[in-house]
Amino acid sequence: LPAQVAFTPYAPEPGSTCRLREYYDQTAQMCCSKCSPGQHAKVFCTKTSDTVCDSCEDSTYTQLWNWVPECLSCGSRCSSDQVETQACTREQNRICTCRPGWYCALSKQEGCRLCAPLRKCRPGFGVARPGTETSDVVCKPCAPGTFSNTTSSTDICRPHQICNVVAIPGNASMDAVCTSTSPTRSMAPGAVHLPQPVSTRSQHTQPTPEPSTAPSTSFLLPMGPSPPAEGSTGD
């Protein structure tokens, strides 16, 4: 005959542990049922009665099988620089992550405690390493023969146009200006021209609270301001 299945509450065999989704109640000295996610223990078990579970109240949750007397409080509402990526339900806490153009300067177990705006690189500087969810943009000066004329958290330095006859030589923050004969561009054919307005909001070392408005496309920007360092180097 198969061994009889014990129903909670029951006294465990000496040296054995309670089964999955059960816990050992020290007071009753019995194996008792845990409460499912979204519930908590309203009444603890005794030698003769099992755990009584109840649903979590609004704005509280339990994520695991448990025997806690009260559900956990959901975190406070997401701040204006954050987006709610997971809502508060009876089974999960609210998760706030930084909105586009911001990164997490101080993380918590899940989501972000403090968001900060991504640094903007000023003209003459480009994005050496893009920002990630948890790290700021790194700005570096444009290398010889390249330039950036924007203040941006996404734009990289791009090559000066190559002139048959140069009217004004390029520098780190300005493209070369050619005389009327057509210039050649250090660019592969077929790249898309998407002009963007030039902004001059901040220095490369001083972040400003405006979000990045980098296009989400993979197109390159050969003729307008510098192409964005599209996407981010994630951690």
């Epitope: 690189c121 500087f125 480009g126 994005v127 050496a128 390493r129 893009p130 990630t132 790194v138 700005c139 570096k140 000066p141 444009c142 290398a143 390249t146 950036s148 990289i156 330095c157 791009r158 660019m187 592969a188 790249a191 993979s218 197109f219 390159l220 192409p227 360092a229 599209e230 996407g231 981010s232 180097t233 994630g234 951690d235």
Partner: antibody, heavy 118, light 107 residues
Framework: EVQLVQSGAEVKKPGATVKISCKVS????????LHWVQQAPGKGLEWMGW????????KYGQKFQSRVTITADTSTDTAYMELSSLRSEDTAVYYC???????????WGQGTLVTVSS | DIVMTQSPATLSVSPGERATLSCKAS??????VDWYQQKPGQSPRVLIY???IRYTGIPARFSGSGSGTEFTLTISILQSEDFAVYFC?????????FGQGTKLEIK
């Protein structure tokens, strides 16, 4: 034009530590991020990590994280890569590479051969 | 980690002809791909960055294209000095990863 000059070849025993230097000239080291890249004999390139000498921030590849330390001395415009607990498979050429505002590795050092042999 | 797969491993082409090298990413990397050339006994040098921007001083015969997961380096008219190993590299996410390389040899 920026130039990167690395220290000479090294022969090390397993378990030892090697420290390679990369001297930046022509520009200030703070104008660049400095990457370190490994190339084992007849193999491809493997990124080890970078340092931003301006802020002292580093980022390491997970494969090397426990054994590599990248530092920079802005007073001498020199970056260093230290690899510890060397094993035979660390026998490789190690390159430093400078990353400007283009977001790419614009300039590379000449490479340093490290041989790990008992 | 994002895996960059280059094909073919070896490409035999005659001087004056066109060479097309392929690089595929295991996941979307946007336009965050660079191409490097390495000759025997030398350090790599950047040719193309952000998938299609030719680095300053690189001859116009080199061009890059692609976005997402598929990238191509094209050398329009091969010169003798172009025979080398070519690597693609993604910088979309850490760790930065390189392809295993394509050896371009003289046919």
């Amino acid at each position: 034009e920026v130039q990167l000059v690395q220290s000479g070849a090294e022969v090390k025993k397993p378990g030892a530590t090697v420290k390679i230097s990369c001297k930046v000239s022509g520009y200030s080291i703070t104008d660049y991020l400095l990457h370190w890249v490994q190339q084992a004999p007849g193999k491809g390139l493997e990124w080890m990590g970078w340092i931003d000498p301006e802020e002292g921030k580093t980022k390491y590849g997970q494969k090397f994280q426990s054994r590599v330390t990248i530092t920079a001395d802005t007073s001498t415009d020199t970056a260093y890569m230290e690899l510890s607990s060397l094993r035979s498979e660390d026998t490789a050429v190690y390159y430093c590479a400078a990353n400007s505002g283009t977001g790419t590795m614009d300039a590379w050092g000449q490479g340093t051969l490290v041989t790990v042999s008992s | 980690d994002i895996v960059m797969t280059q094909s073919p491993a070896t490409l035999s082409v005659s001087p004056g002809e066109r060479a097309t090298l392929s690089c595929k990413a295991s996941q979307n990397v946007g336009s965050n791909v660079d191409w490097y050339q390495q000759k025997p006994g030398q350090s790599p040098r950047v040719l193309i960055y952000k998938a299609s921007i030719r680095y300053t001083g690189i001859p116009a015969r080199f061009s890059g294209s692609g976005s997402g997961t598929e990238f191509t380096l094209t050398i329009s008219i091969l010169q003798s000095e172009d025979f080398a190993v070519y690597f693609c590299m993604q910088s979309k996410s850490y760790p930065i990863t390189f392809g295993q390389g394509t050896k371009l040899e003289i046919k």
